[in-house]
Interface confidence: low
């Protein structure tokens, strides 16, 4: 067991937020400004984020975690980590890559991102058209004759938006 | 009413350049840090680099930071862009913004214009 001990690697007892330093006989020493180390025993530590440019930061950068960065108001992340920041658009349009473009008759976005998507087709479920539909909301489905029995729910209520970050980009 | 709007762009070789322009009208151009940002093919938008009102303060994004300068010319109303050593991750869409003049330097911008595409291919 000693023997095992004294063939340990030194620099597997770094904490993390400190670097394993080679040019100090293998001392732990900390990891510099605006650096960080997560995990104990690391050689370097990592160059933290930095949230520039249409990127925010959402938590400092600190000597055991990396820098978290959001989108400036106006925009919204994608990718992991929130790799890239897109444009916000209003209700009731779509980012193209022409910008901004309101959604087309027939389909809707209760969203300031994601896609235009279609109006329910009531009569499919053998519904009418309760209320129409806009750029900005579904269209509510009104009861099928069926649904007017004493007892029933007269109106079907549209359809729960998707999450944010579900809708397809 | 603002108005904003690029040109310059076009087909260039890798290594080629190029200059963008973005004319400003229906405002006090020389009130306003402006700024370039672009959105590559199916990608999010980038902020590429900005300067102050009077083009004493500039930045860059580190992917364009030695290649790209920012100008402008306050008594012409314009904003310009010089690309230098293009690539081919350079071809984007790139749109000149006007920052919201509450916050300037802050990158939360409040009028785009319509963009013009660079891209980069030999």
């Known amino acids: 067991f000693e023997r095992t001990r004294s063939l340990q690697d030194p620099c597997s007892n770094c904490p993390a937020g400190t670097f394993c330093d080679n040019n100090r006989n293998q001392i732990c020493s900390p990891c510099p400004p605006n650096s960080f180390s997560s995990a104990g025993g690391q050689r370097t530590c990592d160059i933290c984020r930095q949230c520039k440019g249409v990127f925010r930061t959402r938590k400092e950068c600190s000597s055991t975690s990396n820098a978290e960065c959001d989108c400036t108001p106006g925009f919204h992340c994608l990718g992991a980590g929130c790799s890239m920041c897109e444009q916000d658009c209003k209700q009731g349009q779509e980012l193209t890559k022409k910008g901004c473009k309101d959604c087309c008759f027939g389909t809707f976005n209760d969203q300031k991102r994601g896609i235009c998507r279609p109006w329910t087709n009531c009569s499919l479920d053998g519904k009418s058209v309760l209320v129409n539909g806009t750029k900005e909301r579904d269209v509510v489905c009104g009861p099928s004759p069926a649904d007017l029995s004493p007892g029933a729910s007269s109106v079907t209520p549209p359809a729960p938006a998707r999450e944010p970050g579900h809708s397809p980009q | 009413e603002v108005q904003l709007v690029e040109s310059g762009g076009g087909l260039v070789k890798p290594g080629g350049s190029l200059r963008l322009s973005c004319a400003a009208s229906?405002?006090?151009?020389?009130?306003?840090?402006m700024s370039w940002i672009r959105q590559a093919p199916g990608k999010g938008l980038e902020w590429v680099s900005h300067?102050?009102?009077?083009?004493?303060?500039?930045d860059y994004a580190d992917s364009v930071k030695g290649r790209f300068t920012i100008s402008r010319d306050n008594a012409k109303n314009s904003l310009y862009l010089q690309m230098n050593s293009l690539r081919a991750e350079d071809t984007a869409v790139y749109y000149c913004?006007?920052?919201?003049?509450?916050?300037?330097?802050?990158?939360?911008?409040?009028?785009w214009g319509q963009g013009t595409l660079v891209t980069v291919s030999s």
């Open positions: 300067i102050s009102s009077s083009g004493s303060t500039i």
């Open positions: 913004a006007r920052e919201d003049p509450r916050m300037p330097g802050t990158f939360d911008f409040d009028n």
């Open positions: 229906g405002f006090t151009f020389s009130d306003y840090y």
